[in-house]
């Protein structure tokens, strides 16, 4: 027999199918030009020493073969002895290791069998009523097709499904959508209405995420506030990665899970922007403010469940960084400026009250004054920190106040509002005899002592009403008692106590008169 012809003789090997799992499969035959035809197939198993034979039986019952050697593709013309206008049955027999392996048969009319392509290019994936919808452009000149899909998960084998007949410039398929696992899909097409026409190759994998993105399982810590007033949010555990089917491993566009970090700065509510969303990989530096944090997972079908945290404010206070001067027109704060053209946010709230009751004020961008200080002033009429109580003050700074992650903490401290010098005056001053020339003076703690770091010291003043001599005694802010010694019996004295802050002298308490009785010896 000539090599270009189908040989109508017995093939040169015994006729017995080994029934082995390996062998030829996926035989496709079609017309490739006006008078030429091609059959191709796949061979599974070791290829060394394998010879392939394309078998053909005509409707008359006569059968022939083409010897393909080791190739898995064979072309022939309409003059090769195979009827192209009538139905023929074709299959492949592979002779290997002294045994024959057969492919499944295809029965078709070769002239009308067009080589169909699988879906090419971009396959759009969307969700429709809990199912997966795939859509693609019909390959050129191939309108009218039957379409099948196959799909698998990381733990399950291929399952076959049917998309039904297609007859348009775009084709589509409804497929099952898994809730919690990724899937790999492949599609194939064949000519519609052409009995026995061959299936195209399978398309490239289409990788589809689960309907629900995996819950983020991350762990955070926050570092201590640094000298620059910022602290780093650190990721202790990465989110778990989605398990992918075999064909989606490596680069799998479509199954990506995006993890985003949403920051909400709770402190300084008067600033322009309170929320910022970042990629989880980029861990931000934060000020010492309080924040709420969420990690949101999403895939092409939308967001999933999120994971949330609260980062408490850093309450480490700087007792000396803030100077406050109270004048007739109002109050001015001074603190070391951070840099040129900084916006400051001054936040205050009464101590012991819920964080939701904080008030704040935003300054215009300001440069340091000649002494290197930044300032904020307010009038008495504004009512700011006007009540005689302890306030917790935090000052934040940013050169870019619109960027949430560029705020830093300048200082946190306590301040006693209103008329602190009068409100802080100690009450219930009492004098008790201590010895023949000394007394013990006690008083109730000043209101200023409720405000950490505000009360610098008490001063106790003793005045000799005869000589008009005055002595003053400084007392630690934690003490509410002092012993006055070197006093003379029978002399009238007055004692007063005041409470001083670092920037303000207190008001003396009401004078308390006393004298040490003269001891008469028997």
């Amino acid at each position: 027999c000539r090599t270009s012809e189908c040989c109508f003789q017995d093939p040169p090997y015994p006729d017995a199918d080994s029934g082995s799992a390996s062998g030829p499969r996926d035989l496709r035959c079609y017309r490739i030009s006006s008078d030429r035809y091609e059959c191709s197939w796949q061979y599974e198993g070791p290829t060394a020493g394998v010879s392939h034979f394309l078998r053909c039986c005509l409707s008359s019952g006569r059968c022939c073969y083409f010897a393909a050697g080791s190739a898995t593709r064979l072309q022939f013309s309409d003059q090769a002895g195979v009827s192209v206008l009538y139905t023929v049955t074709l299959w492949v027999e592979s002779w290997a290791r002294n045994q024959t392996e057969k492919s499944p048969e295809v029965t078709l009319q070769l002239y009308n069998s067009v080589k169909y392509e699988p879906p090419l290019g971009d396959i759009k994936v969307s969700k429709l009523a809990g199912q997966l919808r795939m859509e693609w452009e019909t390959p050129d000149n191939q309108v009218g097709a039957e379409v099948q899909f196959r799909h698998r998960t990381p733990s399950s084998p291929w399952k076959l499904g049917d998309c039904g007949p297609q007859d348009d410039d775009t084709e589509s398929c409804l497929c099952p959508l898994e809730m919690n696992v990724a899937q790999e899909f492949q599609l194939r097409r064949r000519q519609l209405g052409s009995q026995g026409s061959s299936w195209s190759k399978w398309s490239s994998p289409v990788c589809v995420p689960p309907e629900n993105p995996p819950q983020p399982q991350v762990r955070f810590s926050v570092e201590q506030l640094g000298q620059d007033g910022r602290r780093r949010l650190t990721l202790k555990e990465q989110p778990t990665q989605l398990e992918l089917p075999e064909g989606c491993q490596g680069l799998a566009p479509g199954t990506e899970v995006t993890y985003r970090l949403q920051l909400h700065m709770l402190s300084c509510p008067c600033k322009a922007k309170a929320t910022r969303t970042l990629h989880l990989g980029k861990m931000p530096y934060l000020s010492g403010a309080a924040y709420n944090v969420a990690v949101i997972s999403s895939n092409q079908f939308g967001p999933g469940l999120n994971q949330t945290w609260h980062i408490p404010a850093d309450t480490h206070t700087e007792p000396v960084a803030l100077n406050i001067s109270v004048g007739t027109n109002g109050t001015t704060m001074y603190w070391p400026a951070r840099a040129q053209s900084m916006t400051y946010c001054i936040e205050w709230q009464p101590v012991g009250q819920d964080g939701g009751l904080a008030t704040c004020s935003l300054t215009a961008p300001q440069d340091p004054d000649p002494a290197g200080m930044a300032t904020y002033s307010w009038s008495r009429e504004s009512g700011a920190m006007g009540q005689e109580k302890c306030y917790y003050i935090t000052i934040f700074a940013s050169a870019h106040p619109e960027k949430l992650t560029l705020w830093s903490t300048v200082l946190s401290t306590y301040h006693f509002g209103g008329n602190a010098s009068a409100a802080g005056t100690p009450h219930h001053v009492s004098v008790k005899n201590h010895s023949l020339d000394s007394v013990s003076v006690d008083w109730a703690p000043s209101l200023l002592s409720t405000c950490p770091g505000v009360l610098k010291e008490y001063v106790v003043r003793c005045r000799d009403e005869d000589s008009k001599q005055v002595s003053e005694h400084p007392v630690q802010p934690t003490e509410t008692q002092v012993t006055l010694s070197g006093l003379r019996a029978g002399v009238a004295y007055t004692v007063q106590v005041r409470a001083d802050t670092a920037w303000l002298r207190g008001v003396w308490s009401q004078p308390q008169r006393f004298s040490i009785e003269v001891q008469v010896s028997d």
Partner: nanobody
Framework: QVQLVESGGGLVQAGGSLRLSCAAS????????MGWFRQVSGKEREFVAG???????YFADSVKGRFTISRDNAKNMVYLQMNSLKPEDTAVYYC??????????????????WGKGTLVTVSS
């Protein structure tokens, strides 16, 4: 491995108070952020209150001003003081822990260790 055991649950009239305790063992307690969560049958577990190793606290809006959380690092204990209780506070209360610095998880999947829970019933 950290073990957590809750106690102090029970039946209380609306407006009353209860104090829940959580005893922790098996880890460097002061390094853990501790939290209380609650769950009503058939619903998601929800955050109630949390406390860091240095006793910074945070509360769910629904309990703010009524509940307080505290810890005793020397005794490896966390407490939830519940005042002005309402019928809607009825739930199983769980103590939870995570080894973290300065960040209080407010969703259950942020916690690594859980107690078995104690039932709080508030009758009207």
């Amino acid at each position: 491995q950290v073990q957590l055991v809750e106690s102090g649950g029970g039946l209380v009239q609306a407006g009353g108070s209860l104090r829940l305790s959580c005893a922790a063992s098996g880890g460097p307690f002061s390094g853990y952020v501790m939290g209380w969560f609650r769950q009503v049958s058939g619903k998601e577990r929800e955050f109630v209150a949390g406390i860091t190793g240095i006793s910074s606290t945070y509360f769910a809006d629904s309990v703010k001003g009524r509940f307080t959380i505290s810890r005793d690092n020397a005794k490896n204990m966390v407490y939830l003081q519940m005042n002005s209780l309402k019928p809607e506070d009825t739930a199983v209360y769980y103590c939870a822990a995570v080894n973290s610095f300065g960040v209080i998880p407010t969703s259950p999947n942020g916690m690594d260790y859980w107690g078995k829970g104690t039932l709080v019933t508030v009758s009207s």
